[in-house]
């Protein structure tokens, strides 16, 4: 166990030019509050998921008028450090979010309004007990200047308050075999109580005879390195030597939420989701109001109307949960229309149209034909997105430019001659068959399948396809 | 919008029993507190009883005045809000609204309960 | 069990400003006790109006505030109406127990 702590010095105007206009004017008073969110491990998360590590907020700094005409200075800070308790071993490696607020004082109908006024990141290494590491960073046109680091809480100690210290038993030195406590020399390192054989840089206890493990390993003794591939079954298979996260309890068993809060199973652990009132890993921070700045990502805070709606978070587009803290996945609900690609871009919802259609959801069906002329008195037919020429008789391909061949695909059956003409073709009919194609045999009697053929034409005689 | 629909009211002997029954739509009924408020006639409000959601064991609460006679309840799949009046007294006569609690206060338009010999 | 008091009757005059309160008898109105202001109009018509002191309801017109003064919850109405004449009450929550005050009559002459 520990303390993440965080020391705001500076937050202003960054070098260059364009510097940004101050938050606060005459008219519009406002203070400055910061938010630190901490996460384990250097994965690139994005910032709404949750503060695995913890979070914090700062007090709210003295009230700032800009002065007229002055160009905006660094902005007066709120006092004190900003404390994230943490009840695990640290793990050496973590993303941190830090947020600046501006909380304005005017005149608001319904009390005082936040927004959020710059969003940095970042992904460290820090070990536990080091001295203050410095830090600058830069969001849009400002600059935050903060340094930070871990310590361990008596009586754990170590570059990730693992290991247990204990007041030294005798004046002089330490047991057989136990090291004195740096920087703590008149401490000594605690008798070894984790289950045998646990791993000394990978597991840690705070009991006797358990073996906890660190992020990213797994095993009894937390010697396998966990991975997520070759895992069957939802925690993976028994066998050790895969590397999968071994069947046992789950992380949600005796739920670990506290004050109502429901937990779901994650790859890495488990998160709960806390009711109104109360945030944090395990929902142990309570008594939360609009004062506290619970809402994220801009999320409008409104005091709520009985205690347990102690706040309600207004979140804006493309956020929701009750402190605006999960992103929607607005594409699961598929608005693009007729096959189009959804792009979720944060801000705003694309969707990119296959060929055919358009409209901000896909909704409109192009007209195919729209300039598409067919040639030589062709007609033009749509679908699906695309055109298709229906061509008059004697010409073909897809605009009907080509002259066809009516005789090319042998129309005249049981051996007709086929002659092309102006109008389509003409079958010559071998003795014995009539019709337009030669279809019709002539009955041995003189008399036809057919009704008596028309004037002028005889059975035998060419007949004309019209 | 959101509704609030009262139903079970009615008239009733002292130390009869009545059952009254809300109905609500158009929000996450799961998620919230929910009360009973009555008004008696040609008086104020008087706060009745309050039961909380799931997360919080859906925990109850009453006014001293109706205490072991009367019982909150819901039913979560049903989005349904009860109170069980039992052994009613003259005094209990009053309009019963049903009432949810959330940025600002959401009312149904009542039903009323008149106890009477 | 706490009380809650109320004036219970004030006139004001349209266009005026008229500042309706609600007192403890716990001691002063904090934000753990999300006073909410409700309006009733004859034939049992109850409206939300605020809610947390001073989180107005949609539709609620931009004259209804809600605010804590000194040790008390208060409702203003900034030019007041002839439709603002009704009964409202406040509603005080003590952890998880909710008391009314008994109700001011305004009457907007």
């Known amino acids: 166990a520990g303390v993440f702590e965080l020391q705001i010095h500076s937050f202003g105007p960054g070098p260059g030019p364009g510097a940004p206009r101050s938050p606060c004017s005459a008219r519009l008073p406002c203070r400055l509050f910061f938010r630190v969110c901490l996460k384990p491990g250097l994965s690139e998360e994005a910032a709404e998921s949750p503060c695995a590590l913890g979070a914090a907020l700062s007090a709210r700094g003295p009230v700032y008028t800009e002065q007229p005409g002055a160009p905006a200075p660094d902005l007066p800070l709120p006092d004190g450090l900003l404390q994230v308790p943490f009840r695990d071993a640290w793990p050496g490696t973590f993303s941190f979010i830090i947020e600046t607020w501006r909380e304005e004082l005017g005149d608001q109908i319904g009390g005082p309004a936040w927004s959020l006024l710059a969003r940095v990141a970042g992904r460290r290494r820090l070990a536990a007990g080091g001295p203050w590491a410095r830090d600058i960073q830069r969001a849009g046109a400002w600059e935050l200047r903060f340094s930070y680091r871990a310590r361990c809480e008596p009586p754990a100690v170590g570059t990730a308050c693992t290991r247990l210290c204990r007041p030294r038993s005798a004046p002089s030195r330490c047991g057989p075999g136990l090291r004195p406590c740096a920087p703590l020399e008149d401490e000594c390192e605690a008798p070894l109580v984790c289950r045998a054989g646990c791993s000394p840089e990978h597991g840690f206890c705070e009991q006797p005879g358990e073996c906890r493990c660190l992020e990213g390993w797994t095993g009894p003794l937390c010697t396998v390195p966990v991975s997520t591939s070759s895992c069957l079954s939802p925690r993976g298979p028994s066998s050790a030597t895969t590397g999968c996260l071994v069947p046992g309890p789950g992380p949600c068993d005796g739920n670990p939420c506290a004050n109502g809060g429901s937990c779901s199973e994650t790859p890495r652990s488990f998160e709960c989701t806390c009711p109104r009132g109360f945030y944090g890993l395990r929902c142990e921070v309570s008594g939360v109001t609009c004062a506290d700045g619970p809402c994220f990502n801009g999320g409008l805070c409104v005091g709520g109307a009985d205690p347990d709606s102690a706040y309600i978070c207004h979140c804006p587009p493309g956020f929701q949960g009750s402190n605006c803290e999960k992103r929607v996945d607005r594409c699961s609900l598929q608005p693009c229309r007729n096959g189009g690609l959804c792009l979720d871009l944060g801000h705003a919802l694309r969707c990119r149209c296959r060929a055919g259609f358009a409209g901000p959801r896909c909704e409109h069906d192009l007209d195919d034909c729209a300039g598409r002329a067919c040639a030589n008195g062709g007609t033009c037919v749509e679908g699906g997105g695309a055109h298709r020429c229906s061509c008059a008789l004697g010409f073909g391909g897809r605009d009907c430019r080509e002259r066809a061949d009516p005789c090319a695909a042998r129309p005249c059956a049981h051996g007709g001659r086929c002659y092309a003409h102006f109008s389509g073709l003409v079958c010559a009919c071998a003795p014995g068959y009539m019709g337009a194609r030669c279809e019709f045999p002539v009955h041995p009697d003189g008399a036809s399948a057919l009704p008596a053929a028309p004037p002028g034409l005889r059975p035998g005689d060419p007949q004309r396809y019209l | 919008e959101v509704q609030l629909v009262e139903t079970g009211g009615g008239l009733v002997q002292p130390k009869g029993s009545l059952k009254l029954s809300c109905a609500v739509s158009a929000f996450t009924f799961t998620t919230y507190a929910m009360n009973w408020v009555r008004q008696a006639p040609g008086k104020g409000l008087e706060w009745v009883a309050r039961i909380r959601n799931k997360s919080n064991n859906y925990a109850t609460y009453y006014a001293d005045s109706v205490k072991d006679r009367f019982t909150i309840s819901r039913d979560d799949s049903q989005s349904m809000l009860y109170l069980q009046m039992n052994n009613l007294k003259i005094e209990d006569t009053a309009m019963y609204y049903c009432?949810?609690?959330?940025?600002?206060?959401?009312w149904g338009q009542g039903t009323l309960v008149t106890v009477s010999a | 069990q706490a009380v809650v008091t109320q004036e219970s009757a004030l006139t004001t005059s349209p266009g005026e400003t008229v500042t309706l309160t609600c007192r403890s008898s716990t001691g002063a109105v904090t934000t753990s006790n999300y006073a909410n202001w409700i309006q009733e109009k004859p034939d049992h018509l109850f409206t939300g109006l605020i809610g947390?002191?001073?989180n107005r309801a949609p539709g609620v017109p931009a004259r209804f505030s809600g605010s804590l003064i000194g040790d008390k919850a208060a409702l203003t109405i900034t030019g007041a109406q002839t439709e603002d004449e009704a009964i409202y009450f406040c509603?005080?929550?003590?952890?998880?127990?909710?008391?009314f005050g008994g109700g001011t009559k305004l009457t907007v002459l």
């Open positions: 947390g002191h001073n």
């Open positions: 009432v949810f609690y959330y940025d600002y206060v959401y």
């Open positions: 509603g005080l929550w003590y952890s998880n127990h909710l008391v």
